[in-house]
Amino acid sequence: MNGRVDYLVTEEEINLTRGPSGLGFNIVGGTDQQYVSNDSGIYVSRIKENGAAALDGRLQEGDKILSVNGQDLKNLLHQDAVDLFRNAGYAVSLRVQHRLQVQNGPIGHRGEGDPSGIPIFMVLVPVFALTMVAAWAFMRYRQQL
């Protein structure tokens, strides 16, 4: 049985300065183009190499953009959201929601990012205990000789 996948949600304010080729990312979503089921929010679908967003480093593909320069992105048509970014000016403030994947459930059934799925301490503690028991047994054995 696989573990349940949960998400740790964090929010961040990201201030970008429009570069020579713009802000440097793509978006999906909107009321007419839901990217996530039952969610008409706006999501980052692509970050352009060497663009303003990539050079800043904080915005990630998959992030949900909540607002642009204080303007809420809820219940917007896709194209209206695109236009909002294009008309946002030179300095652009983004309120962003990051979703970090967290694994819950049985050990050994984790995602591709961790093939073994076993935390290091789960290996080290038994090994340390076994070593201690072996050392104690060896000492007892030597005393009996």
């Epitope: 713009g22 990312f25 793509n26 007419d32 183009q33 990217y35 980052v44 692509r46 663009g51």
Partner: nanobody, 125 residues
Framework: DVQLVESGGGLVQAGGSLRLSCAAS????????MAWFRQGPGKEREFVAT????????YYADSVKGRFTISRDNAKNTVYLQMNSLKPEDTAVYYC???????????????????WGQGTQVTVS
């Protein structure tokens, strides 16, 4: 990711028409912004036309406005370029391009696109 294959190029007389097709393989084609670029002999690759996710957000280069029409069929994972009133200066290799989602910057720039086809030759005599 998406793979793009262009077809429909050929030799045509000035004033004639051609219809180029770009077949895309991959998931979520309807979420891609699609475009056509061209590269004439000894020239830089230049923007021709682009279409947004649901046949909206259409832009054309000034040199082709009124003569070329870009469209897409999301059910067939295909984008088209209908070229009418062709001129000798339209001679070029025509490339299909794609990017996932909508660029928040200009979609007319070559750098906005991540995926490219191999191109199809159009020669106007």
């Amino acid at each position: 990711d998406v793979q793009l294959v262009e077809s429909g190029g050929g030799l045509v007389q000035a004033g004639g028409s051609l219809r180029l097709s770009c077949a895309a393989s991959g998931r979520a084609f309807d979420r891609y912004t699609m475009a056509w670029f061209r590269q004439g002999p000894g020239k830089e690759r230049e923007f021709v036309a682009t279409v947004g996710w649901n046949d909206n957000s259409i832009y054309y280069a000034d040199s082709v406005k009124g003569r070329f029409t870009i469209s897409r069929d999301n059910a067939k994972n295909t984008v088209y370029l209908q070229m009418n009133s062709l001129k000798p200066e339209d001679t070029a290799v025509y490339y299909c391009a794609a990017t996932f989602g909508s660029p928040v910057d200009t979609p007319l720039d070559r750098g906005a696109y991540d995926f490219w086809g191999q191109g199809t030759q159009v020669t106007v005599s």
